[in-house]
């Protein structure tokens, strides 16, 4: 018979994708690189269902997702179209705030403690989630 493809150890399967949930923190760019080295990408949230799934696993923690406007327009790291896709910004966000005094604006998106998205300084260290297609992760 045909063998069932599974996610690697420590990864969680959901709707044909595999997810890995960090327990440490990194800046957005380092988190992005970490996922790439695992043959994955930072999580791309495409529906309420996926949003709830990730939230349930991460709990109420600031968590980087694969959405950035460092190059101007908001872009998902896997090329999913931002404009037509699912969005779950916290009210009043994104605001590209400069008042934090860290230099520059806020160019990377993360889950806030209640799951809504916020844009923040990419250098801040937050937890992160990697995602890949079933069978692709290292």
């Amino acid at each position: 018979g045909s063998e069932r493809i599974c996610c690697p150890i420590n990864w969680v399967e959901y709707e044909g994708s595999c997810y890995w949930f960090s327990s440490s923190v990194k800046p957005w760019t380092e988190a992005d690189k970490y996922c790439q080295l695992e043959n994955a990408h930072l999580v791309v949230v495409t529906s309420w269902e996926e949003q709830r799934f990730v939230q349930q696993h991460m709990g109420p923690l600031n968590t980087w997702i694969g959405l950035t406007d460092q190059n101007g327009p908001w872009k998902w790291v896997d090329g999913t179209d931002y404009e037509t896709g699912f969005k779950n910004w916290r009210p009043g966000q994104p605001d590209d705030w400069y008042g934090h005094g860290l230099g520059g604006g806020e160019d990377c998106a993360h889950f806030t403690t209640d799951g809504h998205w916020n844009d923040d300084v990419c250098r801040r260290p937050y937890r992160w989630v990697c995602e890949t297609e079933l069978g692709k992760a290292n």
Epitope: P73, E83, G92, P94, D95, D96, Y98, G103
Partner: antibody
């Protein structure tokens, strides 16, 4: 494609107010702050401030504080910049701009008695 | 406020020549610097952001470099359509500020 279309040229007398509009299309209006920049004829560019279309929050440079008001109407994806107590040295082209690259065509405001 | 000083204020160049414009910030701005091109009677056009990243659709003749306080934009081989005024702009913090501009014209 992204477009920022501004209202037409205005002629005002000193002491009056002007309200310039900037209609956005081709992107999610609430996902990006709208900046306003002006250019006095023959001079360089001068940043005036921005508005966050989500909640109407704004940040104005000190030079224009008290005279400028930036607002928006999300239902029609339009940002507005109102400048009051106009003086002759406010004669300039006013531009709206989106982060890193998209600019309106400019609106010439002439202040003359 | 952060002051942005551009040099030279004007530059005459022949087609095909390499042109370099510099911009100095009065304090460190990391790489939060943009370069903007403006031709007479038209709206500004963004060329470069984050000091060295080319805006999509901009010719690879243009390149930017620098970090901290000193930045440059280079046109490797200037073409007729490149004759314009170039501004640097910092977006490290409010208020955003521009250089006074460098006019590049035909020799």
């Amino acid at each position: 494609q992204v477009q920022l279309v501004q209202s037409g040229a205005e002629v005002k007398t000193p002491g009056a107010s002007v309200k310039v509009s900037c209609r956005a299309s081709g992107y999610t209006f609430t996902s990006y702050n709208m900046h306003w920049v002006r250019q006095v004829p023959g001079q360089g560019l001068e940043w005036m401030g921005w508005i966050n279309p989500n909640n109407g929050g704004s940040n104005y440079t000190q030079k224009f504080q008290g005279r400028v008001t930036m607002t928006r109407d999300t239902s029609i994806s339009t940002a507005y910049m109102e400048l009051s107590r106009l003086r002759s040295d406010d004669t300039a082209v006013y531009y709206c701009a989106r982060k890193f690259g998209d600019w309106g065509q400019g609106t010439l405001v002439t202040v003359s008695s | 406020d952060i002051q942005m000083t551009q040099s030279p204020s004007s530059r005459s160049a022949s087609i095909g020549e390499r042109v370099t414009i510099t911009c100095r910030a009065s304090q460190g701005i990391s790489n939060y610097l943009a370069w903007i091109q403006q031709k007479p009677g038209t709206a500004p056009k963004s060329l470069i952001y984050a000091a060295s990243s080319l805006q999509s659709g901009v010719s690879s003749r243009f390149s930017g470099s620098g970090f901290g306080t000193d930045f440059t934009i280079t046109i490797s081989s200037v073409q007729r359509e490149d004759f314009a005024t170039y501004y640097c702009q910092q977006y490290n913090g409010y208020p955003f500020t521009f250089g006074h501009g460098t006019k590049v014209d035909i020799k």
